[in-house]
């Protein structure tokens, strides 16, 4: 779970050790603040749960790519 250290900054202190299916993912945001101990990705699932993930892991990069493409492709 991400932790809010103040109103403006949310940090991840631990990463999920399970790969999440892209079908369960709704969106993501990047955590790059130098106030945080680690750079991270926070995935939001389709049931609005937020999950911290390690952006160095290939599945995380692939999931970000998938979501980016989904956002850019107009729905029929």
């Amino acid at each position: 779970q991400p932790d809010a250290i103040n109103a403006a900054v949310t940090c991840c202190y631990n990463f999920t050790n399970r790969k999440i299916s892209v079908q369960r993912l709704a969106s993501y945001r990047r955590i790059t603040s130098s106030k945080c101990p680690k750079e991270a990705v926070i995935f939001k699932t389709i049931v609005a749960k937020e999950i911290c993930a390690d952006p160095k892991q290939k599945w995380v990069q692939d999931s970000m790519d998938h979501l980016d493409k989904q956002i850019q492709t107009p729905k029929p």
């Epitope: 990047r30 130098s34 101990p37 680690k38 750079e39 952006p55 160095k56 956002i71 850019q72």
Partner: antibody
Framework: QVQLVQSGAEVKKPGSSVKVSCKAS????????MHWVRQAPGQGLEWMGR????????KFDPKFQGRVTITADTSTSTAYMELSSLRSEDTAVYYC??????????WGQGTTVTVSS | DIQMTQSPSSLSASVGDRVTITCKAF??????RAWYQQKPGKAPKLLIH???SLEHGVPSRFSGSGSGTDYTLTISSLQPEDFATYYC?????????FGGGTKVEIK
Amino acid sequence: QVQLVQSGAEVKKPGSSVKVSCKASGLTISHTYMHWVRQAPGQGLEWMGRIDPDNHNTKFDPKFQGRVTITADTSTSTAYMELSSLRSEDTAVYYCARGVFGFFEHWGQGTTVTVSS
Amino acid sequence: DIQMTQSPSSLSASVGDRVTITCKAFEDIYNRRAWYQQKPGKAPKLLIHGATSLEHGVPSRFSGSGSGTDYTLTISSLQPEDFATYYCQQFWSAPYTFGGGTKVEIK
């Protein structure tokens, strides 16, 4: 506060090698990627490659593949870039930068490398 | 490599002007682009990354827009400290590539 401090200016002969260091403070380098970007005099920015200090995996622009070596020492929070077979076109300011997403949030102050006979 | 074409290469403007710099990628980069500001003798400074993420401490007069292959950096009201060179960069796929830069000069 994140700081990246690079080694000093170098003057090198064509055909030789140069090794530039980048010491990080205010962050654990194993939690990010360390990149190297160069800028020739009056020119634009050129990404050379990066390292994951956690596992020493590297990725390079094919243009530099075989001529550049990027290493990192997590015990001293220092990244290194070595460029071999130097030619005059390698005269540039070399920057280290950090970021896992492919953009660069913090930069070193730059190291000027001059290649001249 | 994904080529990034930036225009104009230079422009002259006055304090208070609205300034627009454009960047065209040779393929879709899905909003994975960043904008940097560089002053002479200094390292580049990150301004914007991704769709519209303004870097912490960057004034709100800077904004980014665009999608697909076409992206824009806008400075809504140019300030004296904004005279510099600006670069776009794509981080959709390695090797990460930069535009050629836009030098913003005082008119």
